[in-house]
């Protein structure tokens, strides 16, 4: 069935998914399974930050330009519980989590773990918001590429129970001994979808703002004790942020979070919504986004009701851009698109018709051009300005979705779709 109007990843939960996993295991011929290195001139480091230790604190993965390039690569999915959470999200038995762990548990992403920050420069900051069923580590291809071009990227792990899994510490003593409290994805009844998704997107926006405040506090020299005992000195971040150059980026539910965050927090100068799922947003936000906003969509995820809501963000006095990546699917923005070979990736809808590296490259370059323009960066990202306009053989300017049919419009905006 397909009820993506109220669930952007419903297609992953069909009973066929179990068969697909079995095929995945049987084939196990992954082919190209590497998360790509950043294309920019900077080496990239990675660390995690949790402050404070409670579920009301901030938890994020930080990608940043690093001083050296000789550290161990970063473990992509760092705890077994994340695999259990993914199996719950996919609607499979928790044992499937162990199989996923077997397949992906030792996979790394090309960032130097706990490498020192490259000093001597103030970096623009991007706060990144993950999609439903994801968590802070699953968009490393985007985070690493941005960091390789001179950004500090804070990939938030949301505690609104939209992540497959996340953890916190009940108290200080639990934090000291590393006794994690795990929080798993919340499955909603249909009658809860509207109000809970809206509450979640509001909390997510607050978590993005809180992450920004924390990093700006550290930048100002406020001593912050990371609840995670890691060999990265947060004091390195003092005076490292270009405090006027801050953006928010997110995928799917994270795309809605971008819009909610922009409407609430003017410190974010612009936003990029990657294949945004608009359903969680309340009607009041559309007219309250003064900052420039860029929609980068996949070809096969979007549908009329969603595009109509994106268009509601438009007004003559506001900077709005939209492009669609030809042959792309919803999962082209997340790392799982790189975790399997072509055939299996296609079967699982992790890959589209377009090569995954080409798709993420287009998205990243268009994003960099947009960020340069609206954060006032003195870089060479304007070489990709044409991508913002959709001027490329693999791009569609605007959208491929027809929203002029009133019948479709009304049918899809009701919020209740029948199972197909």
């Amino acid at each position: 069935f397909d009820w993506q109007y109220i669930n952007p990843v419903a297609h992953m939960k069909s009973s066929a998914w179990v068969n697909k996993i079995q095929v995945l295991m049987a084939a196990a011929s992954f082919g190209q399974t590497k998360i790509p290195r950043g294309n920019g001139p900077y080496s990239v480091g990675c660390t995690d930050l949790m402050f404070d230790h409670t579920n009301k604190g901030t938890f994020l993965r930080l990608y940043y330009p690093s001083q050296d390039n000789d550290r161990l690569d970063t473990l992509w999915i760092p705890n077994k519980e994340y695999f259990w959470g993914l199996s719950k999200f996919l609607g499979t038995h928790w044992l499937m989590g162990n199989i996923l762990r077997l397949l992906f548990g030792s996979m790394t992403t090309p960032a130097n773990w706990n490498s020192p920050l490259r000093p001597g420069e103030k970096y623009p900051l991007v706060v990144f918001s993950h999609g439903l069923g994801a968590f802070r580590t699953l968009y490393s291809a985007i985070g690493i590429d941005l960091a390789s071009h001179g950004f500090i990227v804070a990939a938030v792990e949301h505690r609104d129970r939209s992540a497959s899994a996340t953890y916190y510490f009940k108290d200080q003593s639990a934090a000291e001994i590393g006794d994690k409290s795990w929080l798993y994805l919340r499955t909603l009844k249909q009658e809860e979808e509207t109000h809970i998704r809206n509450e979640q997107v509001r909390q997510r926006a607050k978590e993005c703002s809180q992450a920004l405040s924390l990093i700006l506090d550290i930048d100002h020299g406020k001593p912050v004790k990371n609840a995670l005992d890691l060999k990265f000195d947060m004091e390195q971040l003092k005076d490292s942020i270009d405090r006027e150059k801050i953006a928010v980026i997110g995928h799917s539910f994270g795309g809605a979070t971008v819009i909610q965050t922009l409407s609430e927090d003017q410190r974010f100068r612009c936003g990029i919504a990657l294949d945004a799922w608009m359903f969680p947003l309340g009607d009041e936000v559309y007219s309250r986004i003064p900052q420039p906003l860029f929609f980068i969509n996949s070809e096969y995820f979007q549908y009329p009701a969603n595009i109509i809501k994106m268009k509601k963000c438009y007004s003559p006095d506001k900077e709005r851009k939209m492009i669609t990546i030809r042959g792309s699917v919803h999962q082209n923005f997340a790392d799982f698109t790189f975790a399997t070979g072509k055939i299996i990736g296609h079967m699982l809808k992790l890959k589209g018709d377009i090569d995954s590296n080409v798709a993420i490259d287009l998205s990243n370059k268009a994003s960099l051009a947009f960020l340069q323009k609206h954060l006032g960066l003195h870089k060479d990202f304007d070489q990709w300005d044409c991508l913002i306009e959709g001027d490329d053989e693999n791009l569609i300017p605007g959208t491929n979705i027809n929203t002029t049919n009133q019948h479709i419009m009304l049918q899809n905006s009701s919020g209740i779709e029948k199972y197909n």
């Epitope: 579920n55 009301k56 505690r159 609104d160 129970r161 009940k170 409290s181 929080l183 919340r186 009844k189 809970i196 509450e199 979640q200 509001r202 909390q203 607050k206 609430e264 309340g282 009041e284």
Partner: antibody, heavy 121, light 107 residues
């Protein structure tokens, strides 16, 4: 339909203990928190605190630390408020209300009918 | 703790009138303001959350607005059944706090 049903009125003497209940129905009990609110006769509303129905962890407002306890019976979807060493100023109507365990800006959307507790010697 | 002040303890109105009830917070509560209606002998009923979002089933004559520290609850055309106590509440940070209440009366 979401419902919170509270137990009947209580008449107690100073120094005694009262335990009042709030039975929830119409939703998944362990997804939503239970809050307690006090309303003294002719007065406004005062938030006492809440209990996380997933973990059982209670949180109290400063004025309600010490003599007050929140507890759960998850099997029957029931939350309890216990007040020890009752004082005259505990005379009030006590409301339970639904919040959310992890959405920490989620306000109290459904309320019980209220339980009148009278403390008099 | 965040203090909420409802300046008017009582407000007189007539059926069909438009009425505004104000609520001022001692600090920015980021639109996390709810409005409740309480009739005599009943429990409070949520009308508005997040300053302007109507709760399920609430008639559209009830609206809310505001941001920062200043919030307004409006009944566009008062009905006889709207005579009640109205409380604002902040759901931004614990301890959650309520305003003192505004009693709506018929002239």
């Amino acid at each position: 339909e979401v419902k919170l049903e509270e137990s009947g009125p209580e008449l107690k003497k100073p120094g005694e203990t009262v335990k009042i209940s709030c039975k929830a129905s119409g939703y998944t009990f362990t997804d939503y928190s239970v809050h307690w609110v006090k309303q003294a006769p002719g007065k406004g509303l005062k938030w006492m605190g809440w209990i996380n129905t997933d973990t059982g962890e209670p949180t109290f407002a400063d004025d309600f630390k010490g003599r007050f306890a929140f507890s759960l019976e998850t099997s029957t979807s029931t939350a309890y408020l216990q007040i020890n060493n009752l004082k005259n100023e505990d005379t009030a109507t006590y409301f339970c209300a639904r919040g959310d365990n992890y959405l920490y800006y989620y306000t109290m959307d459904y309320w019980g009918q209220g339980i009148s507790v009278t403390v008099s010697s | 703790d965040i203090v909420l002040t409802q300046t008017h303890k009582f407000m007189s109105t007539s059926v069909g009138d438009r009425v505004n009830i104000t609520c001022k917070a001692s600090q920015d509560v980021n639109t996390a303001v709810a409005w409740y209606q309480q009739k005599p002998g009943q429990s409070p009923k949520l009308l508005i959350k997040w300053a302007s979002t109507r709760h399920t089933g609430v008639p559209d004559r009830f609206t809310g607005s505001g941001s920062g520290t200043d919030y307004i609850f409006t009944i566009s055309s008062v009905q006889a059944e709207d005579l009640a106590l109205y409380y604002c509440q902040q759901h931004y940070s614990t301890p959650w706090t309520f305003g003192g209440g505004t009693k709506l009366e018929i002239k």
